[in-house]
Interface confidence: low
């Protein structure tokens, strides 16, 4: 009887483990066997694919064979008994473009209020992503497990933290990779449960805030509790996302070691340029909080995004405002290289009624004012770019009077 | 003042464990930011960093090694010591410990201070 | 791992030349948080090394303003611009930017 060749022949791909597939055309056939060739593009002849020779299973492994994961290759397999069948040749394909992203590997960390996520890829030096490593994002989904209601989060990086989280309350997750550059994404990691810890008695810091004053950054925060020491540590941002060296690792700022206010002040050139992540711990000598919410701070924006510098031309009934590059100390411009918008508000000295003007441009009027009446300005600036909406603290009030009636021209 | 100083064998057959201890003062490992490192070197030869380990117990491995490397701590009295198993010919060389900051705030370094260096050889 | 190429392998000098080496990486050494973590030692003889420079061309302290490090990316050189008996020995470089660590081979300065 003539064996009928395999039909339905399916290759998956997960990193670097490549599988396939395939229907027997004939059940009623016993002991046959099916064996694979594979071709490469450009290449006449056929090779033998290693693992997958004469197998009596209708699946087998090919992950040995090192290809070329970018370089196109055609399959085809054959039944065999004492005879064998036609070949039947299963669609060229590229394994990099057929390739699924596997389960990555989820390590959890529980605080109080927080659980604290390790994330790698699952295959560890991955042939197949290996130009693609660094760009790896992942998403979660993540619940409460006596409730279930699920809450997805995108875009992470191998280590996110999850705050606001219940204390004593054990929490589920699983969690996926993205290659965003090539449209992958990938399967879910198993469900990793953990439960958060009992209340810390001291709370973290909260509200950290960054601001320059002269050539000093002012980090401040807000804390429940009085005769507390903190300390402050940064790490780069970039490192959050890939922390594949050893050199990964928070690193304290000397002075805001053991601080006994909640502020401290810092010389701007402790950071080269970039964006860095701050965090602050609290401690009373015998306990210590966890650390704070993280907060990003970007060099560029921060230690440039001064209040700007006006001059008033005063008129009867308006004010002409020029606004100028704001000064560093020593009375040097600071050079804005991004475009900022300005935020001017103006009020009579003896009231509180206050009227705001925004404007892009670096001169600006301030119409339909009182003849002698003594206004009120102050102003900032703001980022155009969305992605870095900052704002600059305001400037000192500058009060000035209005000149007498009819002196407009 | 910062001095770091190694001990060991001297002389050991093959497929034996060398271990190796490093003793130190002027710092402590339990200090934030605050590492050991292992580093040897073959008689006449260059260097070979083989492992470190952190203030926080993290540890770092040369992956060439790594199967036959262990490095450990004790805070407490002021020592770091790294275990090699199953040595050969090859592992014979002088093992130096030194001191490995976290390279942060100011000062990048990434080691500051070397001890004087345990001889070792391996042979049957 | 990070290969670094050092020449020469070694250097004849009289007292008071100036003496210059290269170390030469074969990848860039500059780290995300655009440091470089590259150093120099000296080894004297049947001495343990001690740092010289790091970060590319940041004396440490007590090392004397003679030995000046420069460089960037993948090409570093340390220049002593005036040699003196206790500058002889085995100079390495050392990069700790990528995992592991590695050194050059050695430069070996010693008088003609």
């Known amino acids: 009887k003539n064996l009928k060749s395999p039909q339905k022949v399916e290759v998956d791909i997960i990193d670097d483990n490549f599988i396939l597939r395939w229907n027997r055309s004939d059940e009623s056939v016993g002991n046959v066997t099916f064996s694979f060739d594979y071709q490469k593009t450009g290449m006449d002849n056929w090779i033998k694919l290693s693992g997958c020779q004469n197998i009596t299973s209708t699946k087998c492994n090919f992950s040995s064979l090192k290809l070329n994961v970018y370089e196109e290759i055609k399959l085809r397999i054959r039944a065999e008994k004492e005879n064998t069948s036609s070949w039947y040749e299963v669609d060229s394909f590229t394994p990099f473009r057929k390739a699924q992203i596997g389960p990555p590997e989820v390590h959890l960390e529980a605080e109080d209020k927080a659980i604290v996520i390790h994330i790698s890829p699952g295959t560890k030096d991955s042939v197949m992503w290996a130009l693609d490593g660094l760009s790896f994002t992942y998403s979660l989904v993540i619940w409460k497990n006596s409730s279930g209601v699920e809450e997805r989060i995108e875009n992470i990086y191998s280590r996110h933290k999850i705050y606001k989280l219940s204390p004593e309350t054990t929490y589920c997750l699983k969690v996926k990779a993205a290659l965003l550059t090539s449209w992958k994404i990938g399967v879910y990691s198993p469900v990793h449960c953990i439960k958060t810890t009992v209340e810390n008695e001291l709370p973290p810091p909260e509200n950290i805030e960054v601001s320059v004053q002269n050539q000093n950054y002012v980090l401040k925060w807000d804390y429940t509790y009085a005769n507390m020491t903190f300390q402050v540590q940064w790490l780069h941002a970039f490192l959050k996302r890939n922390p594949g060296n050893h050199l990964y690792k928070w690193k304290q700022i000397p002075d805001c070691e053991n601080v006994k206010t909640t502020q401290c002040v810092f010389p701007q050139n402790v950071f080269q340029k970039g964006i860095y992540l701050l965090r602050v711990q609290a401690s009373d000598g015998n306990n210590t909080s966890f650390w704070s919410e993280e907060i990003k701070f970007d060099t560029e924006i921060q230690a440039f995004l001064l209040p700007p510098v006006f001059n008033i031309r005063s008129l009867s009934d308006s004010f002409h405002i020029y606004i100028g590059a704001p000064k560093q100390s020593g009375n040097t411009p600071v050079i804005q290289d991004y475009p900022l918008i300005y935020e001017i508000i103006f009020w009579e000295n003896t009231s509180n009624a206050e009227r705001k003007i925004i404007e892009k441009k670096t001169d600006v009027t301030v119409p339909n004012l009182k003849p002698l009446t003594v206004y009120c300005v102050k102003a900032r600036a703001h980022t155009m770019d969305e992605k870095l909406n900052k704002s600059s603290v305001f400037s000192d009030a500058v009060c000035e009077k209005t000149k007498p009636g009819n002196t407009s021209k | 003042q910062v001095t770091l100083k190694e001990s060991g064998p001297g002389i050991l057959q093959p497929s034996q464990t060398l271990s190796l201890t490093c003793t130190f003062s002027?710092?402590?490992?339990?200090?934030?930011?605050?590492?050991v490192g292992w580093i040897r070197q073959p008689s006449g030869k260059g260097l070979e960093w083989l492992a470190n380990i952190w203030w926080d117990d993290d540890k770092y491995y040369n992956p060439s090694l790594k199967n036959r490397l262990t490095i450990s701590k004790d805070t407490s009295n002021n020592q770091a010591f790294l275990k090699i198993t199953n040595v050969d010919t090859a592992d014979t060389a002088t093992y130096f410990c030194?001191?490995?900051?976290?390279?942060?705030?100011?000062?990048?370094?990434?080691?500051?201070?070397w001890g004087q260096g345990a001889s070792v050889t391996v042979s049957s | 791992d990070v290969v670094l190429t050092q020449t020469p392998g070694s250097l004849s000098v009289t007292l008071g030349d100036q003496a210059s080496i290269s170390c030469r990486s074969s990848?860039?050494?500059?780290?995300?948080?655009?440091?470089?973590?590259l150093e120099w030692y000296l080894q004297k003889s049947g001495q343990s090394p001690q740092l010289l420079i790091y970060?590319?061309?940041n004396r440490f302290s007590g090392v004397p303003d003679r030995f000046i490090g420069s460089g960037s990316g993948t090409d570093f050189t340390l220049k002593i611009s005036r040699v003196e008996p206790e500058d002889l020995g085995v100079y390495y470089c050392?990069?700790?930017?990528?995992?592991?660590?590695?050194f050059g081979a050695g430069t070996k300065l010693e008088l003609k």
């Open positions: 030194a001191r490995h900051p976290l390279p942060g705030y100011k000062d990048n370094y990434v080691v500051d201070a």
């Open positions: 990848q860039s050494l500059e780290y995300s948080d655009q440091y470089t973590y």
């Open positions: 050392f990069q700790a930017t990528h995992d592991p660590y590695t």
């Open positions: 002027g710092f402590s490992l339990n200090t934030y930011g605050m590492g």
């Open positions: 970060g590319v061309s």
